[in-house]
Amino acid sequence: MMTGTIETTGNISAEKGGSIILQCHLSSTTAQVTQVNWEQQDQLLAICNADLGWHISPSFKDRVAPGPGLGLTLQSLTVNDTGEYFCIYHTYPDGTYTGRIFLEVLESSVAEHGARFQIP
């Protein structure tokens, strides 16, 4: 039975040209996290394997930095970066947990962080 919960940074906004940290946290389970995949719609951004380290997709290598921790830093943001991002936790023995973050990249200098929320 999967008892874990993914907590994410929820709906966030950031300025064009700036950077943002995408973070998820898995709680309420003793399952071992073997890997976290970061995806945007149909694209793979990065993989953080607990043992092997990081894979950064070449399409994003100039704008994505690994970390902090299992998170991912997006740099040099453009309006086209607006959209849904997913953290996919591969765990043993539970299986897969998925968290969702919605990022809005704003033209203006006003970019406020949204509230945190949980996805069971």
Epitope: T34, Q35, N37, E39, D42, Q43, L44, I47, N49, A50, D51, L52, G53, W54, H55, I56, S57, P58, S59, K61, P66, H90
Partner: antibody, heavy 119, light 107 residues
Framework: QVQLVQSGAEVKKPGASVKVSCKAS????????MHWVRQAPGQGLEWIGG????????SYNQKFKGRATLTVDKSISTAYMELSRLRSDDTAVYYC????????????WGQGTTVTVSS | DIQMTQSPSSLSASVGDRVTITCKAS??????VAWYQQKPGKAPKLLIY???FRYTGVPSRFSGSGSGADFTLTISSLQPEDFATYYC?????????FGQGTKVEIK
Amino acid sequence: QVQLVQSGAEVKKPGASVKVSCKASGFTFTGRSMHWVRQAPGQGLEWIGGFNPNSGGSSYNQKFKGRATLTVDKSISTAYMELSRLRSDDTAVYYCARSSYYRFDLDYWGQGTTVTVSS
Amino acid sequence: DIQMTQSPSSLSASVGDRVTITCKASQDVKTAVAWYQQKPGKAPKLLIYSASFRYTGVPSRFSGSGSGADFTLTISSLQPEDFATYYCQQHYTTPWTFGQGTKVEIK
């Protein structure tokens, strides 16, 4: 230039262990992991596992967990793969390979080590 | 484990032919796929990474495409040195797995 030089061919009896080495030169381990892949005669490629020299972490194919042990001696830039409780179907060519820089494809391979398990 | 199924398992072609090899993953692996070339008695060589990026020094006649579960390696004009076995590999999740291989033979 990048080189991965593996130890020589081995002939072992069933139940024995074998330890294959892979000496790396021409690059640093940072941002990379070292992997082992085997190929039975006339067959395809099978990933045994990988080792991250930076963190000391290792990831194994469950098929080999408990029988394969991956290590690295950073001081001499050498990776090792030990396989215990050998069976006849472990007869194969064993390759070491390194992952690309911050990628999980395998961009350089050793020349291969033939391990023959026979009574 | 994710299964990678290549087709065909072998093919005969002539120099100058356009050759297409397909690889189907048993689940969505996004673009986490590489292609390798192996000649008899030799170690595999990386051709394509992340589904469509040509590795350094690989001739432009080799190209890769696809995402999700369906991937293709294309050799636009087969050369004598291209007769070999080709493997796809996924690294979306461990254990990393390879296709069973496609042997390209001379017709």
